[in-house]
Amino acid sequence: MAVTACQGLGFVVSLIGIAGIIAATCMDQWSTQDLYNNPVTAVFNYQGLWRSCVRESSGFTECRGYFTLLGLPAMLQAVRALMIVGIVLGAIGLLVSIFALKCIRIGSMEDSAKANMTLTSGIMFIVSGLCAIAGVSVFANMLVTNFWMSTANMYTGMGGMVQTVQTRYTFGAALFVGWVAGGLTLIGGVMMCIACRGLAPEETNYKAVSYHASGHSVAYKPGGFKASTGFGSNTKNKKIYDGGARTEDEVQSYPSKHDYV
């Protein structure tokens, strides 16, 4: 029950996180005009990953896309790439995790397969979250650098009383959305990985027993002892019959990659 809850919660948290990453990537407020020196401005500038916008006091908002690819700063391109990779990985992770959910029955899917998928999606969510956090952090660092550079030459005197004020930009709402969303996706991924441990049932330890049935040589193969890791494939010991007849409680044992995570 706790495993299902952990897995379900991990899925929901990751879903919210990925929705947030998508929202942040699409948002126009990655950087907003710094209003420290002029808290009330008639023209307000803000920029996103894909376009820059200007909102006038009149309410008129004009946005212009960055229609060049080569002319954009490499850092901006890197941030775009990180966010897109984060979204793609997150989306694939969501798809995988839907089928991995314990509460959803798909055919006769083994618990071990579900555990595999849960771990896979968990790792994808973790990487997705890290990509988003990295992307937002790179952009934030870029903003901080530019902010202090523009502060250094904030006012450029032009013949006495005429002055040109350089627009400075500070953190926009999208950065905070991105950080929170990335964190949620990361947490969701960790929860999925934890759930995976509980999903992969322990192998039962049987003592090795041999017996002879008439005309057939039959042996019980002992399950290898698992150190108590708390997870591992539920490798219920397979009885090996030469004759091919099986008893009801037979189940197959597979080596699992989860054993040594």
Epitope: T41, N45, S52, C53, V54, F60, Q163
Partner: antibody, heavy 118, light 113 residues
Framework: QVQLVQSGAEVKKPGASVKVSCKAS????????INWVRQATGQGLEWIGE????????YYSEKFRGRVTLTADTSISTAYMELSSLRSEDTAVYYC???????????WDQGTTVTVSS | DIVMTQSPSSLAVSAGEMVTMNCKSS????????????LTWYQQKPGQPPKLLIY???TRESGVPDRFSGSGSGTDFTLTISSVQAEDLAVYYC?????????FGQGTKLEIK
């Protein structure tokens, strides 16, 4: 079509207050910002302030801050400009105008003449 | 506050002539975000309220004759009337629409000879 109609001329004594109204029609009142500008006889234009009818946000010229109050009643699509502690130099024509793209003032009314005289 | 200075304060021209009037701001009106200059030109005929002519320094308001054109960037702007008509007799004001408080120039009075 867009139309702004202001209240009639006012004659006030120094120290009194005046409240000028500006009724808008032909558009959704909350869609546009309303600006107030005054012009003394034979003088240039002087910006008083603006009001955003949707949220009620106001911005005033420092010169008038504390003496002027801009309000809007969205139910009757009317903006108001109240100027207190009137002085003789407040004698002017008071205009309301809609702010459009480029923060340009479009659709000016004919104006309200306020005369401050003892 | 941004100070707007217009020149000349008045000028008299004959109908059909070209006229230019200047407006200088104490601070740049160019917005880096959209590369637009937030300067507006108004025409005020005697006994009438001002009428919007040009916004964003060079964008003509709809219905304004194409003989009116605006140019300039940053701090220096010009309003040009390519062929003055009798009905252009008015005072022309430039306005800073970039920063609060919005400020107007003192006006340029156009007279027809």
């Amino acid at each position: 079509q867009v139309q702004l109609v202001q209240s009639g001329a006012e004659v006030k004594k120094p120290g009194a207050s005046v409240k000028v109204s500006c009724k808008a029609s032909g558009y959704t009142f909350t869609s546009y910002v309303i600006n107030w500008v005054r012009q003394a006889t034979g003088q240039g234009l002087e910006w008083i302030g603006e009001i955003h009818p949707r949220g009620g946000n106001t911005y005033y010229s420092e010169k008038f801050r504390g003496r002027v109050t801009l309000t809007a009643d969205t139910s009757i699509s009317t903006a108001y400009m109240e100027l207190s502690s009137l002085r003789s130099e407040d004698t002017a024509v008071y205009y309301c105008a809609i702010l459009r793209r480029g923060n340009a003032m479009d659709y000016w009314d004919q104006g309200t003449t306020v005369t401050v005289s003892s | 506050d941004i100070v707007m200075t217009q020149s000349p304060s008045s000028l008299a021209v004959s109908a059909g002539e070209m006229v230019t009037m200047n407006c200088k701001s104490s601070q740049s009106l160019l917005n880096s975000g959209n590369q637009r200059n937030y300067l507006t030109w108004y025409q005020q005929k005697p006994g009438q309220p001002p009428k919007l002519l040009i916004y964003w320094a060079s964008t003509r308001e709809s219905g304004v004759p194409d003989r009116f054109s605006g140019s300039g960037s940053g701090t220096d702007f010009t309003l040009t009337i390519s062929s003055v008509q009798a009905e252009d007799l008015a005072v022309y004001y430039c306005q800073n629409s970039y920063n609060y408080p919005y400020t107007f120039g003192q006006g340029t009075k156009l007279e027809i000879k």
